[in-house]
Interface confidence: medium
């Protein structure tokens, strides 16, 4: 089956700057600002555009060793990034893949709102564990906050 989940997360950082840092340069920035969550990100295939395959490696002691993600869309005009987790992590016996979409929308206070959509494609009649979703959401928010803190401390970066 297919299970959808959405979350909205506000940020004090303007949309264009956040997209540049969190999405376009996330491969370099995330291991730097959140080494406890992401050890490394490497391109296995492609140059970052649609079809690119990335391998994200997690630190020792993490529940999963790595995930492989396929980039589906990078929309620099509308600040939208779509990718699918195709291997590793929770993908396996019960879960075929996870399709994700991140949109960064301007907020009235000059900040922005991340709108995160996840589509969990399960095998057979397997259902999604709500606790697993909660953990994934908290991880995403944690990464955002790490990037946010870096950008607040480095006002000249990613402008």
């Amino acid at each position: 089956g297919v299970f959808n989940y959405e979350a909205e997360t506000p940020s004090v950082i303007p949309a264009a700057r956040l997209f540049k840092a969190f999405i376009l340069d996330g491969d370099k920035l995330l291991p730097k600002v959140a080494p406890e969550a992401v050890s490394s990100v490497e391109n296995i295939e492609g140059n970052g555009g649609p079809g690119t395959i990335k391998k994200i490696t997690f630190p020792e002691g993490s529940p999963f060793k790595y995930v492989k993600e396929r980039v589906d869309e990078v929309d620099r005009v509308n600040f939208k990034y779509s990718f699918s987790v195709i291997e590793g992590g929770a993908v396996g016996d019960a879960l075929e893949k996870v399709c994700n979409e991140i949109k960064i929308v301007a907020a009235p206070d000059g900040g922005s709102i991340l709108k995160i959509s996840n589509k969990f494609h399960t095998k057979g009649d397997h259902e999604i564990n709500a606790e697993q979703i909660k953990i994934e959401k908290e991880k995403a928010v944690g990464l955002l906050k790490a990037v946010e803190s870096y950008l607040l401390a480095h006002s000249d970066a990613y402008n």
Partner: antibody
Framework: EVQLVESGGGLVQPGGSLRLSCAAS????????MSWVRQAPGEGLEWVSV???????YYSDSVKGRFTISRHNSKNTLYLQMNSLRTEDTAVYYC?????????????WGQGTMVTVSS | DIQMTQSPSSLSASVGDRVTITCRAS??????LNWYQQKPGKAPNLLIY???SLQSGVPSRFSGSGSGTDFTLTISSLQPEDFGTYYC?????????FGQGTKLEIK
């Protein structure tokens, strides 16, 4: 059963204050974004305010600086503190849950509470 | 702010008719378009979310479509209980905004 029940509406003079409550059952208020939406007599729906699950709040321009949205997690209740009320704030006020599964649509609504601002 | 404009503002149709209500946004967005039905004296009720997904418990005669700035709610075969006012709403950006409503009466 998942439901929202508003209370606290009533008649108030211009410049006065009211606090609306929205008691939730069947789900946890702090796990969802929650909004207040109002409807003036014979008019359409107008979004008023939102509180995100993380606690960040936003307001429509028409109420900014006068209304405050908040929640009490252990009471599982959403609030709208309304100060410096104006006649144009007269409306039925609904609280609504943003669905985590349905692209932020308002999937659960309370029955509404009437606020009348008049001298 | 994204302005939402509905048409028509009111319409009268017969049981069994196919009814279409349109909603135009002042700027383009995707996915975050919802439709609600409201009956007199009652709270709105979610019918369609994410442009075209049917909310659980809503009859299949209701459907939604569209993209960009133009969206449509269709009732394939009008039933007596479908009277009321219909609203489109964007949940894409703050402030969240509603269309002005379309009042549907049964002939």
């Amino acid at each position: 059963e998942v439901q929202l029940v508003e209370s606290g509406g009533g008649l108030v003079q211009p410049g006065g204050s009211l606090r609306l409550s929205c008691a939730a059952s069947g789900f946890t208020v702090s796990s969802n974004s929650m909004s207040w939406v109002r409807q003036a007599p014979g008019e359409g729906l107008e979004w008023v305010s939102v509180i995100f699950s993380g606690g960040i709040t936003y307001y429509s321009d028409s109420v900014k600086g006068r209304f405050t949205i908040s929640r009490h997690n252990s009471k599982n209740t959403l609030y709208l503190q309304m100060n410096s009320l104006r006649t144009e704030d007269t409306a039925v006020y609904y609280c609504a849950r943003h669905s985590n599964w349905n692209f932020d649509a308002f999937d659960i609504w309370g029955q509404g509470t009437m606020v009348t601002v008049s001298s | 702010d994204i302005q939402m404009t509905q048409s028509p503002s009111s319409l009268s149709a017969s049981v069994g008719d196919r009814v279409t209500i349109t909603c135009r946004a002042s700027q383009s967005f995707d996915t975050y378009l919802n439709w609600y039905q409201q009956k007199p004296g009652k709270a709105p009720n979610l019918l369609i979310y994410a442009t075209s997904s049917l909310q659980s418990g809503v009859p299949s005669r209701f459907s939604g479509s569209g993209s960009g700035t133009d969206f449509t709610l269709t009732i394939s075969s009008l039933q007596p209980e479908d009277f009321g006012t219909y609203y489109c709403q964007q949940s894409y950006s703050i402030p969240y905004t509603f269309g002005q409503g379309t009042k549907l009466e049964i002939k």
